[in-house]
């Protein structure tokens, strides 16, 4: 029967008793930096050629004892995983290794660099197709190796990386940190993240998404035949780059951005028990597992989104915090995040010719977050229109004034550090559509944008109890892009997307304050594509 | 996602003039050295010398023999065991810890990352 | 689904060599670690030892100078012997599957899920 | 060789008790521990593993804790089926080594 790994991530309406995906990623190339391999196991036999680059540190101790089978344990089991006869996820790709792991699963930093380069040079004197990059390793965050993956990746290569085994952030490890790498955390059969003993699944906002990556059946180096239960999260970055060469060879023209989008897109939604993972991090970790795209990988023209977290700003009162998109991407909207609830807005700037969301710390703060809602939005043109604060109890309006410009997503600054004087802004959709309305001392910041079919319409929902959070979401066929809370009383946290789901948060000690008339508001943008259609804004 | 983490980096403590070679005095360094926050994991002795986006690659070999040079001027043998052109411009070099402030002096240079471990996951 | 079944002679001589074999059925022998259990009447488990696919083989040392534990592929099975019997070895014998994953972080790591399957035992009397 | 040590050796209880076992390690096993169920003429079956980790199909009603050196098994609600014997298995080396067993009796 199908192992649980593999009808994991297959479509339910796909699912039989053999695991037969549409599509075996035949047009695609996987290279593994790993250990060496049994390249002659029946599972990978013709599927993998091992290059002669080898980059590897001696083995600790003296009496170190070099076993085949012991050294080629781990990138054999990754092979398979990718594209092994019976237990792989694309039966058609084909691979190459390149040995930057010793027999004791270790390798260096500048081992991986050069492998990275010679995969760079292969691609440069001999142009092929689509190139998956699989780096099912990780060591302490390394400023010159993400710099290498984000060459790379901007040289079109797909480079697909373990979260990491630590139970910890994946933002203190490389190349999981790097924003151009797609980083995979793991979760079990139950669809829990993954913990063995002390190790377990690395989390975080430098996480993409999970895939299955514990008790995985793969290729054994112990004999031709021989098949072994290896766990990890490198073992989940396999199951993802198999299936990003299915995607690669049915669209061979994907962009990374398009890629990472997609499979974000296709993945199960809130399947994961958020609360293994510790109480800062829950809202940072994305709660999706991979899974392949039904067997026409069009999205339906639906816009595709997806939320980025920044660092942590730190508590200094003038500590700001950047979300950026990926360079194809559009930011639609920027939105923030304090779990003290003391923060100064959020707004768009331009920083080296890309827009990027920032967010402000106030007085007293513990810190923000800022979060970016980043869209694929074919032949867009998209500007920020904002106003300066108003006067004290004025409201200040801003709209998209450029014809067929729709309004994506409102962010709000203030320059008071007293938050108690302040009313906190939002979008109010029923008296000015389609404009976002800052009050006392707030400045106003209208994301625009004009791109062909884009419709959009702001959906709000009120909660007038007490509650921690209030949520809106956006139907089936639309997209969320941006989202707002307007509080009920003085103290909200701020607001972030999760899928399609827009979360306003309150701090507890408001909820007390509360009176039965101020409803606390979440407020979404919602928009869809329709390219036959015009622009427009939907009432 | 791009922010640098628990991580180490150090402006180098410099003297403004060494040996009193014009040439090296004339650079201040502005570059920085960066290590692993994971003690066990570090490397001492080998080093990744990045050089700034736009260097050429002429540059890069320059750069990495007025190293050597230099080193040699002051009784360290340095051993340069990989030249890197095509993702970015750069060097791995062996050598002594004591040569890390020369080293960040030398035009071009925009970091120095100590060599560390990585793991199969 | 997955099954074992023991086999052998019920009855064996003192000073003679016990012969068990374990025939695995509804998956392939080649993933699993494959063991070997005792249970005197009346009295706890005791573990002998166990084969991997690749011949791979790990013995609890009380036994390990009169245990061999072989595995037959092609039929899908595997086999204890114990030479040199007494009636103290006189028991249930089961055989049993062990779920174990490797996971690394710094280094490996071998992790089990425990013994999820076994065999309904075999008793094996030793007397003359 | 690790020993491991269980208590109570017998336990009388009657069917919706609330019944608690406790499994020593001689030296800290982490959370490398496996319960298992065991009826006359029948052989053992995997309850828990890793301590806590409850076996697909076992019901609900039992649950692990623990770690290091001591460990339960309870039973929160004593059906007819589970009058049985209970090992614990630790799992953390080989030899794989068992505790001597619990018998739960009916009252």
């Known amino acids: 029967s199908i192992p649980w790994n593999l009808e994991r991530i297959t479509p339910p309406r796909y699912r039989a008793d053999e695991y037969q995906p549409p599509d075996g990623g035949s047009l695609v190339e996987v290279y593994l930096l790993d250990t060496s391999i049994q390249s002659d196991h029946r599972e990978i036999e013709g599927r993998v050629m091992v290059t002669d680059f080898e980059n590897v540190p001696e083995e600790d101790g003296t009496r170190f004892h070099r076993q085949a089978s012991k050294c080629d344990s781990h990138g054999t089991h990754l092979a398979g995983v990718v594209s092994g006869r019976d237990a792989g996820v694309a039966k058609g790709a084909s691979m190459r290794s390149l040995r930057v792991l010793n027999c004791q699963g270790k390798g260096t930093v500048s081992g991986t660099l050069i492998g990275l380069e010679f995969i760079r040079k292969s691609q440069l004197v001999q142009p092929v197709g689509p190139l998956v990059v699989l780096l099912p390793l990780a060591g302490g965050y390394s400023r010159v190796l993400n710099a290498a993956c984000q060459r790379l990746a901007r040289a079109g290569v797909v480079l697909v990386t373990a979260a990491g085994n630590f139970r910890d952030d994946a933002c203190l490890y490389s190349p999981a940190s790097a924003p151009e790498v797609i980083t995979v955390g793991a979760t079990n059969a139950q669809d829990q993240p993954v913990t063995l003993g002390t190790l377990g699944t690395n989390f975080g906002r430098c996480v993409d998404l999970f895939a299955p990556g514990e008790d995985i059946i793969g290729a054994s180096s112990d004999c031709s035949t021989c098949f072994v239960s290896q766990s990890g999260t490198s073992q989940a970055a396999a199951h993802v780059a198999g299936i990003a060469a299915m995607m690669l060879s049915a669209e061979p023209e994907l962009t990374l951005a398009e890629l990472r989008q997609r499979l974000i897109h296709f993945s199960a939604k809130d399947v994961i028990n958020m609360a293994w993972f510790p109480e800062d991090q829950q809202v940072l970790t994305p709660n999706l597992v991979a899974t392949l795209p039904p067997s026409t990988h069009e999205t339906g023209g639906q816009l595709l989104c997806r939320t980025v977290w920044s660092a942590h700003s730190g508590p200094t009162r003038t500590a700001t915090a950047t979300a950026r998109c990926a360079p194809e991407e559009e930011l639609l909207s920027c939105s923030s995040f304090s779990r003290s609830g003391r923060r100064r807005g959020d707004w768009i700037e331009a920083i080296g010719g890309q827009q990027v969301c920032k967010a402000l710390n106030a007085f007293g703060g513990e810190g923000v977050y800022a979060v970016a809602r980043c869209c694929l939005v074919p032949r867009a043109n998209c500007s920020i229109h904002n106003t300066p604060a108003a006067r004290a109890g004025l409201e200040t309006h801003v709209h998209c004034h450029q014809k067929d410009h729709v309004l994506t997503g409102c962010s709000f600054h203030w320059e008071v550090e007293d938050l108690s004087v302040r009313r906190q802004p939002a979008l109010r959709s029923r008296r000015q559509p389609g404009q976002c309305v800052g009050h006392q001392a707030a400045s106003v910041y209208a994301s625009c944008c004009h791109a062909p079919g884009l419709e959009c319409k702001i959906k709000e929902h009120g909660i007038s109890g007490p509650s921690e959070q209030v949520t809106v979401a956006c139907e089936a066929g639309w997209t969320l892009t941006g989202c707002n809370v307007l509080p009920g009383a003085s103290l909200t946290l701020g607001a972030y997307s999760v899928d399609n789901l827009c979360v306003a948060r309150v701090h507890d000690t408001a909820r007390a304050d509360r009176t039965s008339g101020e409803a606390t508001v979440a407020a979404a943008i919602c928009c869809r594509s329709r390219p036959s259609a015009k622009a427009s804004w939907v009432q | 996602q791009d922010e640098d983490g628990d991580y180490e980096e150090l402006m180098l403590a410099l003297p403004s003039q060494e040996d009193g070679l014009a040439d090296e005095a004339a650079h201040v360094a502005t570059a920085t050295f960066r290590r692993c926050s994971k003690e066990a994991w570090r490397l001492p002795g080998t080093y990744i010398v990045v050089l700034m986006e736009e260097t050429q690659r002429l540059q890069i070999e320059q750069t990495a023999h007025r190293l050597q040079t230099r080193a040699a001027r002051r009784g360290y043998v340095i051993k340069v065991l990989h030249i890197f052109y095509d993702l970015f411009p750069g060097f791995l070099v062996k050598m002594s810890s004591d040569l890390l402030g020369l080293a960040l002096k030398l035009p071009h240079v925009e970091y120095i990352e100590e060599d560390s471990f990585v793991f199969a996951q | 689904q997955v099954q074992l079944q023991e086999s052998g002679p019920g009855l064996v001589k003192p000073s003679e060599t016990l012969s068990l074999t374990c025939t695995v059925s509804?998956?392939?022998?080649?993933?699993?670690?494959w063991s070997w259990f005792r249970q005197p009447p009346g009295k706890g488990l005791e573990w002998i030892g166990y084969?991997?696919?690749?011949?791979?083989?790990n013995y609890n040392p009380s036994l390990k100078s009169r245990v061999t534990i072989s595995i037959d592929t092609p039929r899908n099975q595997f086999s204890l012997k114990l030479i040199s019997v007494t009636a103290a070895d006189t028991a249930v014998y089961y055989c049993?599957?062990?779920?174990?994953?490797?996971?690394?972080?710094?280094?490996?790591?071998?992790?089990?899920?425990?013994?999820?399957?076994w065999g309904q035992g075999t008793t094996v009397t030793v007397s003359s | 060789d690790i020993q491991m040590t269980q208590s109570p050796s017998f336990l009388s209880a009657s069917v919706g008790d609330r019944v608690t076992i406790t499994c020593w390690a001689s030296?800290?096993?982490?959370?490398?521990l496996a319960w298992y169920q065991q009826k006359p003429g029948i052989a053992p079956k995997l309850l828990i593993y890793?301590?806590?980790t409850l076996q697909s199909g076992v019901p609900s009603r039992f649950g692990g804790s623990g770690s290091g050196t001591e460990f339960t098994l309870t039973i929160s609600s004593l059906q007819p089926e589970d009058f049985a014997t209970y090992y614990c298995?630790?799992?953390?080396?080989?030899?794989?080594?068992f505790g001597q067993g619990t018998k739960v009796e009916i009252k």
């Open positions: 890793a301590a806590s």
């Open positions: 084969i991997y696919y690749s011949g791979t083989t």
């Open positions: 298995q630790q799992l953390n080396s080989y030899p794989r080594t």
């Open positions: 509804g998956d392939s022998i080649n993933t699993y670690y």
């Open positions: 030296q800290d096993i982490s959370s490398y």
């Open positions: 049993a599957r062990e779920r174990i994953t490797m996971i690394r972080g710094v280094t490996l790591y071998y992790y089990s899920y425990g013994m999820d399957v």
